[in-house]
Interface confidence: low
């Protein structure tokens, strides 16, 4: 069975459990030739697009979305989608961002490293959004 555009992956640096006020960067990855990466929240209720795409490897491109100061409102599920002209890819798996109060205790780790959601072999749903709505008040480089 031929594949369509490969599914993107999403990861978070330094992790998915982020102390209040700290920063987090979502990393979306897809094939080479991607024109636009989109980071979506909660079933496309809000999203951010970037054309600042870099080549991560000979066969992979990536975009980074940074939130400088995480608030409780940033918690929730995130996923990536990309546009490789003239088509949109499927969505990545969801990645859940958790925001925790800073207790300052030495035993409480700041982050949960190595968290990512990669492509699956046969996704059950291909969502295709040819005419996506305009970015809903989000700044070009930051979600909030």
């Amino acid at each position: 069975q031929e594949e369509d555009l490969p599914r993107p992956s999403i990861s978070a640096e330094p992790g998915t459990v982020i102390p209040l006020g700290s920063h987090v960067t979502f990393v979306c990855r897809g094939p080479v030739g991607v024109q636009t990466f989109r980071l979506e929240r909660e079933s496309r209720s809000t999203y951010n697009d970037t054309e600042d795409v870099s080549q991560a490897s000979p066969s992979e491109s990536e975009a980074r979305f940074r939130i400088d100061s995480v608030s409780e409102g940033n918690a929730g599920p995130y996923r990536c989608i990309y546009y490789k002209p003239p088509k949109w890819s499927e969505q990545s798996d969801y990645l859940e961002l958790l925001v925790k109060e800073t207790s300052g205790g030495p035993d409480s780790p700041d982050t949960e490293p190595g968290s990512s959601a990669g492509p699956t072999q046969r996704p059950s749903d291909n969502s295709h959004n040819e005419h996506a709505p305009a970015s809903q008040g989000l700044k070009a480089e930051h979600l909030y």
Epitope: Q1, E2, E3, D4, L5, P31, G33, P85, P86, K87, D125, N126, S127, H128, N129, E130
Partner: antibody
């Protein structure tokens, strides 16, 4: 074997509408494929009308054919349709459906229907 | 829209000749170019995709190349069955656009 079987020739009067069908077989209609429609006027080149994504019905049209062509699918019968409305002599042409396959990171119109001739004459 | 300027519009060649035809894109840096062969009364048949990739089952005498926005289809040794019209298609930018065609005749 992948096959796209189109409906037969049509002779219509100006102002009429017509719905052309394209029945797909030999592959999973709703898997990762788009269906394109292409117009070829007599002795002329090819014009892309638009595509439809059978999985969810999403469409994209050439601006030139917006309001003229409407693309739909019936997933249960693996059939794509193109309706042309308000026909004029300019719409007389052969219309093809063509599947968008995906090979080695490239989209390709790899399989084509045999074409449906539409003649508009008073 | 991206215009695809195809030349020549017709050409005549002898069996065994090397034949070339070109398509020039009006814009676009990373175009996925397809070449098709069409015989009278038949649907187009895919020959080349991605500018230079040969479709399965297509004879190896057909090849495609790209230099910037110029794309070339070459038939290395013309055979009788190659008499047809050839079209290019840019399959990257919406709307997709075809070249005007090159009608190839055998001398």
């Amino acid at each position: 074997e992948v096959q796209l079987q189109q409906s037969g020739p049509e002779v219509l009067k100006p102002g009429a509408s017509v719905k052309i069908s394209c029945k797909a077989s030999g592959y999973t209609f709703t898997d990762y494929y788009y269906m394109n429609w292409v117009k070829q006027s007599h002795g002329k080149s090819l014009e892309w009308i638009g595509y439809i994504y059978p999985n969810n019905g999403a469409t994209s049209y050439n601006q030139k054919f917006k309001g003229k062509a409407t693309l739909t699918v019936d997933k249960s019968s693996s059939t794509a349709y193109m309706e042309l409305r308000s026909l004029t002599s300019e719409d007389s042409a052969v219309y093809y459906c063509a599947r968008d396959g995906y090979s080695s990171n490239y989209y390709t119109m790899d399989y084509w229907g045999q074409g449906t001739s539409v003649t508009v004459s008073s | 829209d991206v215009q695809m300027i195809q030349s020549p519009s017709s050409l005549s060649a002898s069996l065994g000749d090397i034949v070339t035809m070109t398509c020039q894109a009006s814009q676009g840096t990373s175009i996925n170019l397809n070449w098709f062969q069409q015989k009278p009364g038949k649907a187009p048949k895919l020959l080349i995709y991605g500018a230079s990739n040969l479709e399965d089952g297509v004879p190896s005498r057909f090849s495609g190349s790209r230099y910037g926005t110029d794309f070339t289809l070459t038939i290395s040794s013309l055979e009788d069955e190659d008499m047809a019209t050839y079209f290019c298609l840019q399959h990257t930018y919406l709307p997709y656009t075809f070249g005007g065609g090159t009608k190839l005749e055998i001398k």
